[in-house]
Amino acid sequence: MMTGTIETTGNISAEKGGSIILQCHLSSTTAQVTQVNWEQQDQLLAICNADLGWHISPSFKDRVAPGPGLGLTLQSLTVNDTGEYFCIYHTYPDGTYTGRIFLEVLESSVAEHGARFQIP
């Protein structure tokens, strides 16, 4: 039985040209995390593996930095970065937990952080 929950940074907004930290936290489970994937829609952004460390997809290498922790920092944001992002926690023995973040990149200077929410 999967008992864990993922807390994410929720719905967030940021300014064009700026940077943003995407974060997920897996809690309420004793399962061991073996890998965390970060995806944007169907594109793989980055992987952090227990044995191999971080791998950033070549097409995002210039604009994506790992961390802090298991989070991901997106830099030099463009309006095209608006959309859904997913953190996928691979665990043993539970299996896979997925968290969703929606990022809106704004042209103006009125970007504000959205509220946090939990995904069971």
Epitope: L26, V33, L52, G53, W54, K61, A65, P66, G67, G69
Partner: antibody, heavy 117, light 107 residues
Framework: QVQLQQPGSELVRPGASVKLSCKAS????????MHWVKQRHGQGLEWIGN????????NYDEKFKNKGTLTVDTSSSTAYIHLSSLTSEDSAVYYC??????????WGQGTTLTVSS | DIVLTQSPATLSVTPGDSVSLSCRAS??????LHWFQQKSHESPRLLIK???QSISGIPSRFSGSGSGTDFTLSINSLETEDFGMYFC?????????FGGGTKLEIK
């Protein structure tokens, strides 16, 4: 096996600068953050900053921004910390330690830096 | 910056005793809390990751609990090799920070 090798000690004069090294082996150097931690004699651990060798991205504690500079040489899998304008306050053990899926699973033995005239 | 406060600063105990060490964060760090042991003239050693997750090679008498801002490292039936310094550390945000440490000494 994973190893982080650091020189045992360095003796430098006040006002001088020093470059401490940390040679990594047994893993893919560019896939893990390298952190530097300071420990004065008998004191706690202070996080100086980190560098991601895959891109050169760095983060520093504000306290060390004008004191230390982190660099890497990916060809030799070596991380460096350059410490400048040294005073007795900089005398300490400096550790390198890596972070992947979780922080600080492997540590160097530490370099004891002594600043003395 | 996130401040981690450890208590007590020193704990004098007898081998065989069980102890709990506290680490309190100045703001929520969710589950991004790790514990380290350091013996004299040695590098720190990772004991527990992400609050309570075990580390290969670390005895099962070490366990962690807590969430948000309050965390505890528990050591059951202390052995002589367990005496030394214990530090908590957060990886929720940069700059990463350590607690001031708890010294576990033999009574």
């Amino acid at each position: 096996q994973v190893q982080l090798q650091q020189p045992g000690s360095e003796l430098v004069r006040p006002g001088a600068s020093v470059k401490l090294s940390c040679k990594a082996s047994g893993y893919t150097f560019t896939s893990y953050w390298m952190h530097w931690v300071k420990q004065r004699h008998g004191q706690g651990l202070e996080w100086i900053g980190n560098i991601y060798p895959g891109s050169g991205t760095t983060n520093y504690d504000e306290k060390f921004k004008n004191k230390g500079t982190l660099t890497v040489d990916t060809s030799s899998s070596t991380a460096y910390i350059h410490l400048s304008s040294l005073t007795s306050e900089d005398s300490a053990v400096y550790y390198c330690t890596r972070e992947g899926l979780y922080p600080f699973d492997y540590w160097g033995q530490g370099t004891t830096l002594t600043v003395s005239s | 910056d996130i401040v981690l406060t450890q208590s007590p600063a020193t704990l004098s105990v007898t081998p065989g005793d069980s102890v709990s060490l506290s680490c309190r964060a100045s703001q929520s760090i969710r589950n991004s809390l790790h514990w380290f042991q350091q013996k004299s003239h040695e590098s720190p050693r990772l004991l527990i990751k992400y609050v309570f997750q075990s580390i290969s090679g670390i005895p099962s008498r070490f366990s962690g609990s807590g969430s948000g801002t309050d965390f505890t490292l528990s050591i059951n039936s202390l052995e002589t090799e367990d005496f030394g310094m214990y530090f908590c550390q957060q990886s929720n945000s940069w700059p990463y920070t350590f607690g001031g440490g708890t010294k576990l000494e033999i009574k």
